[in-house]
Structure formats: C-alpha cells, structure tokens
Interface confidence: medium
Amino acid sequence: SAPGEDEECGRVRDFVAKLANNTHQHIFNDLSGSVSLSWVGDSTGVILVLTTFQVPIFMITIGQSKLYRSEDYGKNFKDITDLINNTFIRSDFGIAIGPENSGKVVLTADVSGSHGSRIFRSSDFAKNFVQQELPFVPLMQIMYSPQNSDYLLALSNKNELWVSKNFGGKWEKLYDTVCLAKWGSDNTIFFTANHNGSCSNDRGMLELWRTSDLGKSFKTIGSKIYSFGLGGRFLFASVMTGKGTLRAIHVSTDQGDTWSMAQLPPVGHEQFYSILAANDDMVFMHVDEPGDSGFGTIFTSDDRGIVYSKSLERHLYTTTGGETDFTNVTSLRGVYITSILAEDKSVQSMITFDQGGRWTHLRKPENSKCDATARDPEKCSLHIHAAYSIATGLNVPMLPLSEPNAVGIVIAHGSVGDAISVMRPDVYISDDGGYSWTKALEGPHHYTILDSGGIIVAVEQNAHQGVNQIKFSTDEGQCWQTYNFTKDPIFFTGLASEPGARSMNISIWGYRSSLFHQYWISYTIDFKDILERNCEEKDYTIWLAHSTDPEDYEDGCILGYKEQFLRLRKSSVCQNGRDYVVTKQPSICLCSLEDFLCDFGYYRPENDSKCVEQPELKGHDLEFCLYGREEHLTTNGYRKIPGDKCQGGVNPVREVKDLKKKCTSNFLSPEKQNSKSNGSAGGSGGLNDIFEAQKIEWHE
C-alpha cells in the first residue's frame, strides 16, 4: 500500500494548528433540498450558491429558493435573495455565468403557469441584479456568445429561437420550430429547424441554418439533417443518405459554406455517431456498431476531418444512457483513457499516449496485487473507473481528474486485474501522465487538485456515516496527512474548489440533520499557511514527458516533438501561486512512419507501421469529393498526423490534384443552399436532440 502517515513520509509541521486557523464554517439557515454552486469570474473569489426547495402539490410545483454570495472563495456568505425579490430560481438551469471574466450572471426564474418568464441580470459579479420579463419560457439554459457576452441565445418551450443583443434587455424572435441551436465562432448561430413542426418525430428531415448577423439574414447550409455538432474548427452534420434509414457524417471547416463527406461508415437508425474530443487539429469520432452491442469503433481524423483512421475497436459506449469512459488526460499532451468491451464481455481500460495512434492496457501499479479477476496473479493491468462504472451503480464518487497546469498528474478510481472489478475501488495516482501508477488511497474518495498540483485534497466517501476528516498531500499523493475540520461529523455531499486548480481554498459541503432541523453547512479551508513560502527555482526539476527509454535519441517524441517541463520537486512544500505558468521546452523530432496516418484508400495492418492499399480500391483512381470539387489523389498512402511537428527523416510523397469537376457531397452541396433575409424575426427551440455530456463534444 502507499505510504501513509508513517516515518517514511515527511509530515508538514504544525499543520493542525495552521489549518484550524484557516477553517471557516458557514451555516445556511434554510431547509432546501438541493444546493448548486457557481464560480463567477476567474480569481475573483466570487461564488453564488443557490438553494432550492420544491414540493409538488397536485399538478403544480411550489418552490422557493435562496441566493447567497461569497467574495472570499467561500469563507463567508451573504444572503442576497432580496436582490432578486425573493423569486424562485430554477435549479436545473437557473444560473448562467458569462464567459471569461465578464462578470455577467443571468438567473432564470420559474414563473409557473405563465406564457413568459423572468430573468435577473447582473454585470458586476452579482453585486446587483436587474429584473427583466421574457416573452417566452426558456427550455434550457440561456447561452452566451463566446465572443460577446452581451449576445444571448435562448430556446423556448414552444420551439422558438430568441436572441438578445443587449445582455437580455430586449429579445427578438429569430425562428420557429427550431430543434437545436448553438453559438459558433464570430457570433455565428447554427440551428436545425423542421418545417413539419416536430422535433421529435422527424429527425433526419431537419434543415441546418446559419445566421452570421444575429438574425438579419439566414442561410440554409444543409438539408435532411439528423443532427449537428461543433468541435474545434469543425462543423459536423449527420445526414440521411437516401438509402433508407442510413445516415452519414459530413464535415465543414468554413461554417457550412462547403461540405465534404467524412470517410466513415454510415449508421442506421439504432446507431449513433459521437465526437469524443476535438481540437483545431483533429477529431476523435465514435461510430456505434449495429445492434444493441454497447460498443463501437473510435476513428481519428486528418486535419480536414475527412479522412479517418481506425483507432480503437470494441470501444465501450452504451446506447442506453450514452455512457463512455473516454477521458482526455489534460495534464499530458496526447494522452487519453477509455474502456473497451472485450469478447468475454468484461470491461477493460485502455490508454493512448500518441493521440489514438496506439492503445495499450494501463501498467499495473508497483504496490498492488492482481485481484480475483486476474487469470495470472502476476500479470494484470490497472482498470480505471469512469462514467460507465458510475452509471452501473458502483461506489465511484468521482471521474478521473487531471488539470493542464498540474503537469503529469492523473487521479482516478481503479481496480487491478484482468478487467474492471465490481469490488470497492481504490484511488490511484499517476505523476507521469498515465505511464505509471501508484495506489494512493484505500477505498472511494472525493478528490481535487489545488495550487497547480502543489496540494491534493481528498475526503473519504462514506454514505452511511458522517464525515469530519480531510486528507491532503503535498507530494503528488505519496504521503497523506489527515485533518479533522470539525468535531461533529456532517453528511458530506461534495468538495468544491475554483475551476482551474490554481486556488488554495477547498470547500467541504454537507448538511446536518436532526429530528426537527436540517441545514446546509460548508467548511472552507485555506491551505496558504501550509505552503508558507513561494516556490523558487531550486524547487523545480527538469522532467522529460513521455520518456520511456532515456538511452534512445528519440525518447519522448510524441507527434513529432518532445517536451521538457520544469516540475515541482515532490519534496518541496511551497506555493506555485495563482500566477504559475507551466514552463516547457519543446524540441522537434525526425519524422518516422509513426508520424503519418494512412491516407484515403489505405490502412495499417495490425502491428505494422506501413500503410497498405485497401484491396477493394487497388488499381482504381482515387477520386473523392472535397469542398464541391472532384479531387484526384496521388499518394503512396501516408498523411501527416494532425498536430505532428516532425521534420526531416521519412517523408512520403503526397499530391492532390483538382480535377476541375463539380461534384456534390451528397445532400449538402453549395448549389442546394438557400439564403433569405428576415426583416422581422421569428424562431424556435424544441427537444434536446443532441445531448452534451461533460467530456463529450457531441453525441447525436
């Protein structure tokens, strides 16, 4: 087991007294059934807490809510419910925080039985609110334009799309029978509409529309649309192919002006596509297998989102609730973890270090034994619990956690064996982006990263007993100290820390309950006195990411370059600080075949780095439709992996000739696109066709 509070561990001196002086309790005197917490701005210390209490009486729901505000990272709260005239705020999508550091907040009130609704707007980090009546009832949370926080978009419960250009002061109806709407870049709005009036029955008969001028004019950019999604610089649409119920993915990189058909298998009505991750370079696309298999195939795209390479087969993605374990490890470039459904129906974790090029099992932690699932007690792997385990009811209180500014650190629940175990999971930590793992904590815990990895905090999950202890580590999870933050245990509901892992404050939320009384309570602990001094140059050490063989000249090369990082020494107990910036030194690598993906019409046989021609395309001219022109491809089978920066070395030749022939990407050709102007406006929003999960860019 991992070192605990024993002689091996360097204990932090006088930590109990230091933490006791910096532990702040706040009691919320209301009986609300739920509490939601929102951070307003970055490094502002402002937190809004909404408590809601709802009771269904006959056909209507009576509810009340209270609003609290903190401006010191949760140490103290002030009841500001009177600022919103004691109005009941919706708990499901009631608080909408503006992008970046705009200081904007929109609260959506629940005005039962009304044809309209009401919002409260703040532009000063929730110090003051202005009440505004809405001419519609929102169906979902009001959406800010990422580029301009004054521009708001809303979908109504009557399938109408509404826009405001002055932060909710005045609203214009853009369109009717809109099923889904999203902000794109440059204040562009994309939406699907159905002239037949229904969003639920007619998927596959939708039209995709775009307005680049907030509703003055509209352009039809696609028809026979089943669904659409945005990922990175790519716009995707799944389009009915005309062959019965089959649909295919089309992709655009110019906001829908031109489309190309993605080289992906078409899917039937019982299947789905899902963008697992996307950036400006490439896309991870999951394509569901036919039938109720619960798995599919991950494909990785080229830089245009058109040519795809098979990345991982039997990828677990349940059709029922849409659970997948796919996780982007943000603390190290190119690393992703997910699960496969093996032939024997067991669930197994896989990891890639090169953006989906190769997948392997996770290395068994040194300090762990293989569990009962292992056929060989010496040979087994670490298996990570994520969304699928949570959905199946296992005691997994948190998803895997990583932060871009806490380089190399990954924290996750897991089990060690041949497959994921249904036994009680433990907490494992990697300090090198998933190459090696250590068992850090026995049993399930809530955890969070503070001060860019300088501190890791955990609270044991204990559903049946109260909680009064917090554990923390200053050496990336090697050693843990325990601090009793209260004498009387609380029913623990969760940890809260400012997004971005730069804060040194952690809030422990829970409630106390007696026969006659129940109330919410928070304990906010500031670790500033534990990390007494600012880190200096001597506290950091040079670390080569992705290093597996220090003797090899190309050691650490991933996607054509290697990176050396300055990382905090485990033995250093100091503050990285709020302004900490990850220091890295990249160096370019020579190209090898590993830096290329197989081009259109080629594939890689298993365990081979060479790309060979697909038998069915041998001897054929490779012609395909790209941006509405027929292209002729001259290739020896390779295309540079998106984001790969290698130079020199192997350099396969590739040429694309424009055949100057018009062609159409199925149903999305430019000539079939219509424009129109709209003097007045009218709009609409319907059912949520595409749900967006925490880590998933787009699921049909």
Partner: antibody, heavy 117, light 108 residues
C-alpha cells in the same frame, strides 16, 4: 381527422378589403407551417403566402406583397389572410393548406373571392 | 425566382398505360419538389413530397424521382380515376413555393 375550413370569401370592389379565415382541427395546429394557395378560374395553382408555426416568419408571392397579410391565432387554431387593395386579378378560389415536407398535405375546399365593380 | 416547366401540357393515354410526366426547374431545388393531382371542382391532393416520398394513402402506382432540376412523376398503370390535372410544386426556401403550369392527363 384533419380538417381545414375556409370562410370570408365573397364579392368585393377593386380597392376593397376582405379577411379570409381558415379553421383547423384534427392536428396540433401551432406545430405546423400553414399556407394560402389560390386558383383563378380555369387557371393553375398559385402559391400566395406562408406562415411558420409560431407566426414569426412569413413570406408572400411578389404580386401580393404589401397588400396581403398572413397571420394566425394558435389559441383559436385559425389561420387568416387579410387582403387589402384588391384587384381584379386577385379573383380566385383561395385554399388554406397545411405544409408537409416540400408540399401541402391537407387542403381546405376553398373559398371564392371575386373582385369586380 | 425559380420557374417550373411541365411537359407535356396534355397527355392523352388509355387506362392501363404508363404515364410519365416531367417537371423541370430553372435552377436546382434539391429534392424539395411535390406532385399534386386535381380533379374539376376539387382541392388538389398531395401525391409525392420531397421528390420521391409517397404521401399517406397514395397508391403504389404513383412514384416520383429526380433531384436538382429534373423530376418525373410516373403512373405505372393508369386507372380511370387517375385522369386529372397534375401539378408539380417546389419549395426553394423554407417559406417560398412555386407551382408548375400543370399537365392534363386525359383519356385517349
């Protein structure tokens, strides 16, 4: 069963006004785009105007723009066509139609509008 | 504006024969084209929408094909009740429509 019943037609002098109504039943009226189509005696069909489900978007054939106004009252399941500055060439049977796909799947029986002095 | 041209203007056939009606658009209308049948004194009846989809209750002898600018309505074997005027109609935008001039199918 879907039913569309037009009313309000009749004889009117050039320059006069009429308001046509179309009462809908048998379907969720507010969910559907609705249109008016006319047919002059012995002639073909001519699309006149269309309105979206919520009433926010409307369009007209060029010859009636500025003179005709399409509207709807979803609480009454009724479609309207307000016709002002009527001309002799507006004489026709006016049909109310429910949109479906690229076409109109249900039509009323029509109401005759005669513009004559 | 998009103009629809129908040909022939009149088609004289006998029951049991195959009828092929053509509709051409002045520019592409994708697959947004519908066909109607109209008998004297009656409202039009939708036969085909979105170029090739049969409307509810329409017999299988009616079929539509084409996309872009050229469309065809085919009646595989004429029944006595099929003699009527047939109109094509396009939807070039969400709320903009135009009809063709019609083709009269009469008994030879």
């Amino acid at each position: 069963e879907v039913q569309l019943l037009e009313s309000g037609g009749g004889l009117v002098q050039p320059g006069g006004s009429l308001r046509l109504s179309c009462e809908a039943s048998g379907f969720t009226f507010r969910s559907y785009v609705m249109s008016w189509v006319r047919q002059a005696p012995g002639k073909g069909l001519e699309w006149v105007s269309t309105i979206s489900g919520g009433g926010g978007n409307t369009n007209y054939t060029d010859s009636v723009k500025g003179r005709f106004t399409i509207s709807r009252d979803n609480s009454k399941n009724t479609l309207y066509l307000q016709m002002n500055s009527l001309r002799a060439e507006d004489t026709a049977v006016y049909y109310c139609a429910k949109n479906w796909g690229s076409g109109f799947d249900y039509w009323g029986q029509g109401t005759l509008v005669t513009v004559s002095s | 504006e998009i103009v629809l041209t129908q040909s022939p203007a009149t088609l004289s056939l006998s029951p049991g024969e195959r009828a092929t009606l053509s509709c051409r658009a002045s520019q592409s209308v994708s697959s947004y084209l519908a066909w109607y049948q109209q008998k004297p004194g009656q409202a039009p009846r939708l036969l085909i929408y979105d170029a090739s989809n049969r409307a509810t209750g329409i017999p299988a002898r009616f079929s539509g094909s084409g996309s872009g600018t050229d469309f065809t309505l085919t009646i595989s074997s004429l029944e006595p009740e099929d003699f009527a005027v047939y109109y094509c109609q396009q939807r070039s935008n969400w709320l903009i429509f135009t009809f063709g001039p019609g083709t009269k199918v009469d008994i030879k």
